[in-house]
């Protein structure tokens, strides 16, 4: 089948890094500078991605593969193949249309990205607050108030702080 196909279509013999040049009687020509073809049998080469502005070149373009970008310090990648760069904020902040803003009271963000999330409500689990929350850290829940009353036979060890979920990007 491959042999039959190549007899019918001479372009199928053109390897990655080349294109089938219709202007030159379907000869396989190398991709011009700043272009690539990642598969054989291509009739054109694709333009290489340019990493400019906040985008930095992580991998140079070659004749067979596109350039790959990441983001300059102070920014992080979003989207497939780092299609976007989004600004970092400090812990205790979230990014808004107005730039980085401090988390409101009762919320926290322990990362440089994502949104401020509400402190854990310890009382929902029948527990008390062992360590107060901050803009950067969730509260730490401790034993229930009943466990701390005089004469209680045993004290439950403090529950570990919950692992904060990552906000969807």
């Amino acid at each position: 089948f491959e042999r039959t196909r190549s007899l019918q279509d001479p372009c199928s013999n053109c390897p990655a890094g080349t294109f089938c040049d219709n202007n030159r009687n379907q000869i396989c020509s190398p991709c011009p500078p700043n272009s690539f073809s990642s598969a054989g049998g291509q009739r054109t080469c694709d333009i290489c991605r340019q990493c400019k502005g906040v985008f930095r070149t992580r991998k140079e373009c070659s004749s067979t593969s596109n350039a790959e970008c990441d983001c300059t310090p102070g920014f992080h990648c979003l989207g497939a193949g780092c299609s976007m760069c989004e600004q970092d904020c400090k812990q205790g902040q979230e990014l808004t249309k107005k730039g980085c803003k401090d988390c409101c009271f009762g919320t926290f963000n322990d990362q440089k990205r994502g949104i401020c999330r509400p402190w854990t409500n310890c009382s929902l689990d029948g527990k008390s607050v062992l360590v107060n929350g901050t803009k950067e850290r969730d509260v730490v829940c401790g034993p229930s108030p009943a466990d701390l009353s005089p004469g209680a036979s045993s004290v439950t060890p403090p529950a570990p702080a919950r692992e904060p979920g990552h906000s969807p990007q």
Epitope: G53, V54, L78, G79, S83, M84, C85, E86, Q87, P168
Partner: nanobody
Amino acid sequence: EVQLVESGGGLVQPGGSLRLSCGASGFTFSSYWMLWFRQAPGKELEWVANVNQDGSENYYVDSVEGRFTISRDNAKNSLYLQMHSLRAEDTAVYYCARGGEDYGNSHFGMDVWGQGTMVTVSS
């Protein structure tokens, strides 16, 4: 090809004014948030201002509030940054950038950047 090209940078004295332009091509300009960033020598890239699709909503970093004005002309596919009362600390390369699809709702990422224009404030 999607492209942003800045112009209008130059040398200006402290207290002076300058207007930067950013010409857009290869996409429907009026469908996107647009932003200005700057990078001072030896510093990280800093957000300066942004404007929504029709120009009715805009925001500024505190250090330029009241001195800089971001605007756009969708008929001309152009973004502008009018800068007044310029200070030495405004010296930087200024970049325009396009907010990605759904900017301001699900994310605040930028997907297209210009090459930058240099602004030097010095006496």
